[in-house]
């Protein structure tokens, strides 16, 4: 049985203010059952960046079609980047729970930093 791996290939992502950033995350298994969420930072103070099930995230879109069957690509795009968006982003797999889902495994994280403005 294949053990779930969370793959975030970029350790560092240099972005430009006003542009769109793509944060990549793929998984190697559909199991265990449960959702993948995106956070910025770690610990109890981390910020939820995207949850497909609930919440309103107007600047975030998914790279893969939300209706794709057995999807293993959980990459997202964040539009209209501002300096406030810098930080380390983690895709996190949760194991389905009742009533609460339980964190199962996190990706290694991708640090988003501002690159030099093109001249």
């Amino acid at each position: 049985e294949e053990e779930l791996q969370m793959i975030q290939p970029e350790k560092l992502l240099l972005v430009t203010v006003g542009k769109t950033a793509t944060l990549h995350c793929t998984v190697t298994s559909l199991l265990p059952v449960g959702p993948v969420l995106w956070f910025r930072g770690v610990g109890p103070g981390r910020e939820l960046i995207y949850n497909q099930k609930e919440g309103h995230f107007p600047r975030v879109t998914t790279v893969s079609d939300l209706t794709k069957r057995n999807n293993m690509d959980f990459s997202i795009r964040i539009s209209s980047i501002t300096p406030a968006d810098v930080g380390t982003y983690y895709c996190v797999k949760f194991r389905k729970g009742s009533p609460e889902n339980v964190e199962f495994k996190s990706g290694p994280g991708t640090e988003m930093a501002l690159g030099a403005k093109p001249s």
Epitope: L31, L66, K68, R69, N71
Partner: antibody, heavy 119, light 108 residues
Framework: VQLVESGGGVVRPGESLRLSCAAS????????MTWVRQAPGEGLEWVST??????YYADSVKGRFTISRDNSKNTLYLQMNSLRAEDTAVYYC???????????????WGLGTLVTVSS | EIVLTQSPATLSVSPGERATFSCRAS??????LAWYQQRPGQAPRLLIY???IRETGIPERFSGSGSGTEFTLTITSLQSEDFAVYYC??????????FGGGTKVEIK
């Protein structure tokens, strides 16, 4: 994809039965699997789902039924203890399919096996 | 637990006619709804998922629509093999997965 249930039969209240579902035509270990039942002349009722190690049960069977899987044999099981008359139904094994990042529906079903609980 | 209510319970339709029936959820399930067909003596068969996407091999006369709490399955020009029971199922919030009580489509 083929799912073939077996193990149904007639038992008395309080007795036990173990259902099996032999799967073929897909990578069994990659997918969650589910049992759904249908009482005579009634609608469909979800019974239990198993992911990798994660298991989920309807309240009506919790503590009495145990779902398990043997990925080396491509087989799903349902151990049913303390059976009651209201457990009388056709039991279907179904393969889960995932969409929209975290939701499951059932894209392949077996033909079912009949369990009758009667004194 | 999310309750799904299907209506009507029985629909009498002549072959070649259009059949439309509904599934109402007790709370918002977004688009996380599937439709199944069950012919007499057979196992259920997946028709539609994500409220509107036809499963591979399902004829174009079957279509799903709706989101949130109100969903519709439409069969245009009913064929003899379409007379069956149709169930909706939500997978937005589980456990438990829940099914509607079914709509039986019978020959008028």
């Amino acid at each position: 994809v083929q799912l073939v249930e077996s193990g149904g039969g007639v038992v008395r209240p309080g007795e036990s039965l173990r259902l099996s579902c032999a799967a073929s035509g897909f990578r069994f270990s990659n997918f969650a699997m589910t049992w759904v039942r249908q009482a005579p002349g009634e609608g469909l009722e979800w019974v239990s789902t198993i992911g990798s190690g994660d298991t989920y049960y309807a309240d009506s069977v919790k503590g009495r039924f145990t779902i398990s899987r043997d990925n080396s044999k491509n087989t799903l099981y349902l151990q049913m203890n303390s059976l009651r008359a209201e457990d009388t139904a056709v039991y279907y094994c179904a393969k889960d399919s995932t969409v929209s990042w975290s939701g499951d529906f059932f894209d392949y079903w077996g033909l079912g096996t009949l369990v009758t609980v009667s004194s | 637990e999310i309750v799904l209510t299907q209506s009507p319970a029985t629909l009498s339709v002549s072959p070649g006619e259009r059949a439309t029936f509904s599934c109402r959820a007790s709370q918002n399930v977004k688009n996380d709804l599937a439709w199944y067909q069950q012919r007499p003596g057979q196992a259920p068969r997946l028709l539609i998922y994500a409220a509107r996407i036809r499963e591979t091999g399902i004829p174009e006369r079957f279509s799903g629509s709706g989101s949130g709490t109100e969903f519709t399955l439409t069969i245009t020009s009913l064929q003899s093999e379409d007379f069956a029971v149709y169930y909706c199922q939500q997978y937005y919030d589980w456990p438990p997965f829940t099914f509607g009580g079914g709509t039986k489509v019978e020959i008028k």
